[in-house]
């Protein structure tokens, strides 16, 4: 819990590097995102593909989708779930991350020293030992959050099943119901290709206590779907009289010394006339 | 033939609680959420939350959060809704009602006949 | 919230005189929804996503609107349909009803 209240955000006085005074272990061990570069890669034959279960929703279900003011959230039923990790960690909520119109790489993680527009955050929480996301959240083995990083490129269709209902999520605090939908969609290609760490919550308080896992390929949305991302949000109330837009919600890479990063895959891409290899 | 029926209605104390029940039958009863609609007497229509009952998740009006709870019995295809605190403005006929989705969004496609809950002294 | 005002709150009509109910809300939505109530009734869904008729629904009745304003229309009154309207959007939390309209005999 933090010391003095609960007032943080990506810019200004009480930006990231402020943000240990009130959670300190912003300031501590095990902090993500991180840049993944070769140098701390190590492939691992032990990490098999994960199954993801009870991720197709039904639309006939109505989902919360939020505006907390940091980014937006999506709620997910307790009965969708990761297999394949030491316990079952069962959904708790998605949400996103993104830059600016003017400079559109707003992803938390990079890849050797890039950024990507935008990233994707499915979080989970180990339902074998904790009751519920909050109970979890500070403890070991507490969440596996699945990352995917997201670039410029086509139309994606199933993101639109969430840009969709942006409008009616403009302001901090206002929630807005979502069909469901398949959940999996929202994943890149081979997932069975990722890096895995140990690591933190990307915001206050920061928790170290997130299993990482890092799809290694993007997938791809217009630049229309990016630009609505980065202008249909913002981060204070409706009322509020100094509107603050929603943009640049992510978190600097964090010092990553001495640990490794471990990959589902031992090859490197080549690109070759027939496509990737 | 779909159909959902309410129960547990009749004169509370107030400050006392109440526990509805909502009986479904004829569908099944995981592919759709229940809701919890009230309407007091010659008054419009007030929504207080719904249940998933594939896992019990719940959603709440934040007017009835902390004072309403709502469960479900899948054995027996039953939806609960708790209410705590009662008050005079709590009386009101208690609906359940089921949302199905048509391409878009959902829409109320059958509803319970309602429990009148009265609270007085 | 989105606040959902109707209008008129009760009106008296003849039978085959049009009829039109408004409902304004606080804010847009994507789609209006009707149900209608008859005395010691649960309510029924009338209209759908704006414009379609739930099943059974007499084709007298159409529904149209966008963005805040939104109208149920009865072309022609018969006495099936004196009863009260309500409104309702679920493109935001909490989901609203408007207050209703009651449509009396005259």
């Known amino acids: 819990a933090p010391v003095n209240g609960s007032k943080w955000t990506y810019f200004g006085p009480d930006g990231e590097n402020s943000w240990s005074k009130k959670y300190p272990s912003c300031g501590g061990l095990l902090q993500s995102p991180i840049d993944l570069h070769s140098d701390i890669l190590q492939y691992d034959a032990s990490l098999t593909p994960l199954e993801f279960q009870g991720y197709n929703l039904s639309a006939n279900k109505q989902f919360l989708l939020t505006n907390n003011g940091h980014s937006v959230k999506l709620n997910l039923p307790s009965d969708m779930h990761i297999q394949g990790l030491q316990s079952r960690y069962s959904a708790t909520q998605l949400h996103l991350h993104w830059g600016n119109p003017n400079d559109p790489h707003g992803s938390e993680h990079t890849v050797s020293g890039q950024h990507f527009a935008a990233e994707l955050h499915i979080v989970h929480y180990n339902s074998d030992l904790y009751p519920d996301a909050s109970t979890a959240s500070n403890k070991s083995e507490g969440l596996a959050v699945l990352a995917v990083l997201i670039e410029m490129g086509s139309f994606n269709p199933s993101y639109d099943k969430i840009f969709s209902h942006l409008q009616h999520v403009k302001y901090k605090g206002q929630e807005a119901f979502v069909p469901g939908f398949n959940i999996e969609e929202l994943l890149p290609e081979r997932t069975a290709e990722y890096y895995r760490y140990r690591g933190s919550l990307t915001t206050p308080p920061c928790n170290p206590t997130v299993l990482w896992t890092v799809f290694r390929n993007p997938v791809q949305i217009s630049q229309e779907q990016l630009l609505a991302l980065e202008t249909a949000l913002y981060c204070t109330h409706m009322d509020d009289p100094s509107p603050r837009e929603m943009i640049n919600n992510f978190r600097q890479v964090q010092k990553f010394d001495e640990r490794l990063v471990y990959t589902s895959f031992s090859q490197v891409q080549v690109c070759t006339a027939a496509g990737l290899s | 033939e779909v159909q959902l029926v309410e129960s547990g209605g009749g004169l509370v104390q107030p400050g006392g609680s109440l526990r509805l029940s909502c009986a479904a039958s004829?569908?099944?009863?995981?592919?759709?959420?229940i809701y919890w609609v009230r309407q007091a007497p010659g008054k419009g229509l007030e929504w207080v939350g719904y249940?998933?009952?594939?896992?019990?998740?719940?959603t709440y009006n934040q007017k009835f959060k902390g004072r309403a709870t709502i469960s479900v019995d899948k054995s027996k295809n039953t939806a609960y809704l708790q209410m705590n605190s009662l008050r005079a403005e709590d009386t009101a006929v208690y609906y359940c009602?089921?949302?199905?989705?048509?391409?878009?969004?959902?829409?109320?496609?059958?509803w319970g006949q309602g429990t009148l809950v009265t609270v007085s002294s | 919230d989105i606040q959902m005002t109707q209008s008129p709150s009760s009106l008296s009509a003849s039978v085959g005189d049009r009829v039109t109910i408004t409902c304004r809300a606080s804010s847009p939505v994507t789609y209006m929804h009707w149900y209608q109530q008859k005395p010691g009734k649960a309510p029924r869904p009338w209209i759908y996503?704006?414009?379609s008729l739930a099943s059974g629904v007499p084709s007298r009745f159409s529904g149209s609107g966008s963005g805040t304003d939104f109208t149920l229309t009865i072309s022609s009154l018969q006495p099936e349909d004196f009863a009260t309207y309500y409104c309702?959007?679920?493109?935001?939390?909490?989901?609203?009803f408007g207050q209703g309209t009651k449509v009396e005999i005259k």
């Open positions: 004829g569908y099944s009863y995981t592919d759709y959420n």
């Open positions: 996503a704006t414009s």
């Open positions: 249940i998933d009952p594939a896992n019990g998740d719940t």
């Open positions: 309702q959007q679920w493109s935001s939390n909490p989901l609203t």
């Open positions: 009602s089921r949302p199905i989705y048509y391409g878009a969004y959902w829409y109320f496609d059958v």
